[in-house]
Interface confidence: low
């Protein structure tokens, strides 16, 4: 069941969409480029992106900085309850933009810079991305993560955007984990409803890559839940 | 540390216009986002426009949406506020304020550690 404001977009957004995405970006110094596509169905809040180093393979730190962007950004594939207004489908065609700040227990911090438009029935996403601080010793620099647990967006309107709030947790080939605070700023290029506060729920796995890392594969299930919702969707 | 100067401000008449600048040293310019707060004496200082670190997301106050225009130069490493259609009620005096990082409640001077310091415009 969809939102009315959703019914009117779905001449716009339908059940099955393709997206393109390029990042160019940099960690500790570091540049890079990747391009990549994907398709998902934006109304079941399933996606998957197949994903290509360009420039700077093999990258000398872990892909688990970058796989969020790709896809917690790729937000127009969150389901959403009927009641909950959808932001983010609702700003199109004009699309959305959003910048992200993610900051690592050791100090590390990564910016991303990311639009997203509509262009010929397909999603164009534009991201950029810095990482600095990342210790050469750490578990980034290192390659020592082996993807994110699942989580939990906290989602609520401030200054006329929705803002996002995570508490992401990588793991560790030790066993152990390795902490981020992750703010996200929405904003639609143009007046929309926004929602009041709610969670998305939030898989990302890397389903498949080469030995480097320099061709990646990734899965998301995301899912829009009145705050008190759990997780346990995800795992199904 | 982050120093902020501001330039600009003046006398203008109503339906006039005025540039404010800011400039900022001390820090990579890129990693820091930017507010504007105007206070008339007597009252709390009012929200008017802030511009995050990547340019991407800027906010006006109610006031001023649609008359106030702000922006950034990260090569000169300044903000901009060009006020046009000004009013006597906007006559106050403007200060920018900084922050390290993502600026992520724009609209709370509590939120930016780092100020300018100050300059008057008055409408007439």
């Known amino acids: 069941m969809v939102s009315k404001g959703e019914e009117d977009n779905m001449a716009i957004i339908k059940e099955f969409m393709r997206f393109k995405v390029h990042m160019e970006g940099s960690v500790n110094g570091h540049e890079f480029e990747i391009e990549g596509e994907g398709e998902g169905r934006p109304y079941e809040g399933t996606q998957t992106a197949k994903l290509k180093v360009t420039k700077g393979g093999p990258l000398p730190f872990a892909w688990d900085i970058l796989s969020p962007q790709f896809m917690y950004g790729s937000k127009a594939y969150v389901k959403h309850p009927a009641d909950i207004p959808d932001y983010l489908k609702l700003s199109f065609p004009e699309g959305f933009k959003w910048e992200r700040v993610m900051n690592f227990e050791d100090g590390g911090v990564v910016t991303v810079t990311q639009d997203s438009s509509l262009q010929d029935g397909e999603f164009i996403y534009k991201v950029k991305l810095r990482g600095t601080n990342f210790p050469s010793d750490g578990p980034v620099m290192q390659k020592k993560t082996m993807g994110w647990e699942a989580s939990s967006e906290r989602m609520y309107p401030e200054d006329g955007a929705l803002k996002g709030e995570i508490k992401q947790r990588l793991k560790l080939k030790d066993g152990g984990h390795y902490d981020a605070e992750v703010k996200t700023t929405y904003k639609a290029k143009k007046p929309v409803q926004l929602p009041g506060a709610y969670n998305v729920n939030i898989k990302l796995d890397i389903t498949s890559h080469n030995e480097d890392y320099t061709i990646v594969e990734q899965y998301e299930r995301a899912e829009g839940r009145h705050s008190t919702g759990g997780m346990d969707e995800l795992y199904k | 540390q982050v120093q902020l100067v501001q330039s600009g401000g003046g006398l203008v008449q109503a339906g006039g216009s005025l540039r404010l600048s800011c400039a900022a040293s001390?820090?990579?310019?890129?990693?820091?986002?930017v507010g504007w707060f105007r206070q008339t004496p007597g009252k709390e200082r009012e929200f008017v426009a802030a511009?995050?670190?990547?340019?991407?997301?800027?906010n006006y106050g109610d006031s001023v949406e649609d008359r106030f225009t702000i922006s950034r130069d990260n090569a000169k490493s300044a903000v901009y506020l060009q006020m046009n259609s000004l009013k006597p009620e906007d006559t106050a005096v403007y200060y920018c304020?900084?922050?390290?990082?993502?600026?992520?409640?724009?609209?709370?001077?509590?939120?930016?550690?780092?100020w300018g310091q100050g300059t008057q415009v008055t409408v007439s």
């Open positions: 304020a900084a922050r390290i990082g993502m600026n992520y409640y724009y609209a709370r001077e509590i939120e930016y550690p780092y």
């Open positions: 001390g820090r990579t310019f890129s990693d820091i986002a």
């Open positions: 511009i995050s670190w990547s340019g991407l997301i800027i």
